[in-house]
Interface confidence: low
């Protein structure tokens, strides 16, 4: 009877969906070893946790291959939803842009956000600012307390996509005029 119980028990475990792809499986903890090429994933549900053998790791995890057993390891990249490896994100959390395997709330300098894919792409490259120009107002350099001075920069490289705007290439700021009153 004991043998029959063991045999039935094993058969029922093998047919249990949580034991799919397992090399060893228990009623309480699910899989503890997986068939070759599958990834071991420790799923948590409330206070309970059990092992599963998966063809691909769930969102937020990546497949880590090792001689003893392939495992699903958690993405440790900040604001990452799914990743290819421990330091390369493939999809960021909502509101973040993917750039070279990392997630940014704003694209780094020289890159522009592509909202449809939430990626940072090669942006518009601009040169250095010129010196501030002469302080003037309405083409005069006198007569006011305050004027505007302007500086400019050149576009060095056009952006990867036409829809990506270039940063401002001219900016002005208020400046104190050297002469309040115009001579003569």
């Amino acid at each position: 009877q004991g043998n029959r119980w063991r045999r039935n028990k094993r058969a029922s475990y093998v047919s249990n969906p949580i034991c799919k792809g397992c090399l060893s499986c228990s009623k309480d903890n699910g899989c503890s070893r997986c068939q070759q090429k599958l990834f071991f994933f420790l799923r948590r549900e409330g206070m309970r946790q059990y092992g599963e053998c998966l063809h691909s790791c769930p969102s937020g995890y990546y497949g880590h291959r090792a001689p003893d057993m392939n495992r699903c390891a958690r993405c440790r990249i900040e604001n990452c939803d799914s990743c290819f490896s421990k330091d390369f994100c493939t999809k960021c959390k909502v509101g973040f842009y993917l750039h070279r395997g990392r997630c940014f709330d704003e694209c780094p300098d020289g890159f522009a956000p592509l909202d449809e894919t939430m990626e940072c792409v090669e942006g518009c490259e601009v040169g250095h600012w010129s010196e501030w120009g002469t302080c003037s107002r309405n083409n005069r350099t006198c007569g006011f307390k305050w004027g505007l001075e302007t500086r400019t920069r050149q576009i060095v490289k056009k952006p990867a996509k036409d829809t990506i705007p270039c940063p401002t290439i001219a900016e002005s700021r208020r400046c104190k005029m050297a002469m309040r009153h115009c001579p003569g």
Epitope: W146, E171, R173, H181, C182
Partner: antibody, heavy 119, light 110 residues
Framework: EVQLVESGGGLVKPEGSLKLSCVAS????????MSWVRQAPGQGLEWVAH??????????YYSGSVKGRFSISRDDSRNMVYLQMNNLRTEDTATYYC??????????WGQGTQVTVSS | QPVLTQSPSVSASLGASVKLTCTLS???????IEWYQQHPDKSPKFLMQ??????SKGDGTPDRFSGSSSGAHRYLSISNLQLEDEAIYYC?????????FGSGTQLTLL
């Protein structure tokens, strides 16, 4: 003490005209740029028009919403600034403030005069 | 994108401090701005002009009010809030031949 007192507001029909006046005291009026700023009921502030001093040939500037319909002028001998408003629209309904314009900002304000454009 | 962006309302407690923000669009991010205060049914009052790292106040603006700047953001800080500080605060900016106002922030004291 700087004082600005507006007058000339009232009820006018659409496409009608109105001339606002502002008398200034307590400062050398001829040295100051002057502006009109308005505020529609329950809304924010909107700059309307600006006039320079004689030194700058009384140059004038207008916001896009009033350009071609409103005209700002001044009379330095009487310490007065005016806003002639023609072809008035319902959206011109607002309190109109006369302001001293230190250098493209408004450091003193009058109490305002109400303009209502309605049929 | 508006040239000047202000949050519609801010609440703070009597005696506390508050920092109001005016955000400039990218093409105006280096401009000076002005802050104005308006009490209900009263004329606006000029508070100060905020420049890069400094400000110049209007006559009668209390010491409790100060201005500062960071990137495209301009701030109006009010410390030790008093009942009379409950008002709408507008930022404004001159752009050579026109003047633009923000939509205003209603400061409510709790």
């Amino acid at each position: 003490e700087v004082q600005l007192v507006e007058s000339g507001g009232g009820l006018v029909k659409p496409e009608g005209s109105l001339k606002l006046s502002c008398v200034a005291s307590g400062f050398t009026f001829s040295d100051y740029f002057m502006s009109w700023v308005r505020q529609a009921p329950g809304q924010g502030l909107e700059w309307v028009a600006h006039i320079y001093t004689k030194t700058y040939n009384y140059a004038t500037y207008y916001s896009g919403s009033v350009k071609g319909r409103f005209s700002i002028s001044r009379d330095d001998s009487r310490n007065m600034v005016y806003l002639q408003m023609n072809n008035l629209r319902t959206e011109d309904t607002a309190t109109y403030y006369c302001t001293t314009d230190e250098d493209w900002y408004f450091d003193f304000w009058g109490q305002g005069t109400q303009v209502t454009v309605s049929s | 994108q508006p040239v000047l962006t202000q949050s519609p309302s801010v609440s703070a407690s009597l005696g506390a401090s508050v920092k109001l923000t005016c955000t400039l669009s990218s093409q105006h991010s280096t401009n000076y701005i002005e802050w104005y205060q308006q009490h209900p049914d009263k004329s606006p009052k000029f508070l100060m002009q905020v420049r890069d790292g400094s400000h110049s106040k209007g006559d009668g603006t209390p010491d409790r009010f100060s201005g500062s700047s960071s990137g495209a953001h301009r701030y109006l800080s009010i410390s030790n809030l008093q009942l009379e500080d409950e008002a709408i605060y507008y930022c404004g900016l001159s752009d050579v031949s026109l003047y633009l106002f923000g939509s205003g922030t209603q400061l409510t004291l709790l």
